[in-house]
């Protein structure tokens, strides 16, 4: 079977302050099993935005119904965007393990924040 790919179709997204940003991500396979996580930025200082496995992320909702067993759409919506949210967001597939290990990352989506229209 073909190896899993993580697809972030949008190189960039621009959103007005106060609006919601939708960041798209799909995977091409459910194997290997393991959670999806979203990060802002790359490297050791990257910020966790959403973890499929656990955690409380009040501003983040999944766009599709993530509890579907065959779900391959891990797009998220981030509400009430502010200029502090600007950055590049990465959708990352982890492979199960102790601990889970990063398996494949999407290419990233750069979020820019426009001034709130007056």
């Amino acid at each position: 079977e073909e190896e899993l790919q993580v697809i972030q179709p949008d190189k960039s997204v621009s959103v007005a302050a106060g609006e919601s940003a939708i960041l798209h991500c799909t995977v091409t396979s459910l194997i290997p099993v393991g959670p999806i996580q979203w990060f802002r930025g790359a490297g050791p200082a990257r910020e966790l935005i959403y973890n499929q496995k656990e955690g409380h992320f009040p501003r983040v909702t999944t766009v599709s119904e993530s509890t579907k067993r065959e779900n391959m759409d891990f797009s998220i919506s981030i509400s009430n965007i502010t200029p502090a949210d600007a950055g590049t967001y990465y959708c990352v597939k982890f492979r199960k393990g102790s601990p889970d290990t990063e398996f494949k990352s999407g290419a990233g989506t750069e979020l820019s924040v426009r001034a709130k229209p007056s």
Epitope: L30, I31, P32, V33, P35, Q52, K53, E54, E65, S66, T67, K68, R69, E70, R95, K96, S98
Partner: antibody, heavy 118, light 107 residues
């Protein structure tokens, strides 16, 4: 505290139908996929059916497909299992279970006994 | 199908290991369910291979490697006597399966 309480079991004759209910409390029911699992007398556990959090997607073991129907009413925090054309082999304790993010089970109900006998 | 031993016995304080085989490591997540008497509600002691619910004692742990999962009870107690079912979820088939159960006797 998470609570799952099944009801609707009882004694029925072969060929008859029954609808089991599971009342959920102590968590956001509409955020979790749910399943039904049964245990025949002196036997092990057998997964029967699962349903996504929104109720749009259902999954069944082959042996009950077309005969059993899983459904849910999120406004009532309730899960259901409609069982048609019952046979003696369906005699079991029926449990509802809450699914984890990866479709295992973290909480179980106390079960309801279904006896199919002429 | 998942395969586990029919029975295991141990003295109080010993470490017990129960194995479960038959799943593909890359597509299967494992869990362990404790049932203290037939027909009573199962209790999840481990899910997601190695995650322990907050209300389960720390003497219960789990691991998975290759095609097998292991439940470890470190310092087993008399109250741990039960049947332990391994369960699996297969991401290829979308199906949940269970082993036949292992009866743990604490001597």
């Amino acid at each position: 505290d998470v609570q799952l309480v099944e009801s609707g079991g009882g004694v029925v004759r072969p060929g008859e139908s029954l609808r089991l209910s599971c009342a959920a409390s102590g968590f956001t029911f509409s955020s979790h996929a749910m399943s039904w699992v049964r245990q025949a007398p002196g036997k092990g556990l057998e997964w029967l059916a699962g349903i996504s959090a929104g109720g749009s997607d259902t999954y069944y073991i082959d042996s009950v497909k077309g005969r059993f129907t899983i459904s849910r009413d999120n406004s009532k925090s309730s899960l259901y299992l409609r069982m048609n054309s019952l046979t003696a082999e369906d005699t079991a304790v029926y449990y509802c279970a809450r699914e984890t993010w990866n479709h295992l089970f973290d909480y179980w109900g106390l079960g309801t006994l279904v006896t199919v006998s002429s | 199908a998942l395969t586990q031993p029919a029975s295991v016995s141990a003295n109080p304080g010993e470490t017990v290991k129960i194995t479960c085989s038959g799943g593909d490591y890359y597509s299967t997540y494992y869990a362990w369910y404790q049932q203290k008497s037939p027909g009573s509600a199962p209790v999840t002691v481990i899910h997601s291979d190695d995650e322990r619910p907050s209300d389960i004692p720390s003497r219960f742990s789990g691991s998975a490697s290759g095609s097998a999962a292991t439940l470890i009870i470190t310092g087993v107690r008399v109250e741990d006597e039960a049947v332990y079912f391994c369960g699996g979820y297969d991401g290829r088939t979308y199906i949940n399966t269970f082993g036949a159960g292992t009866t743990l006797t604490v001597l």
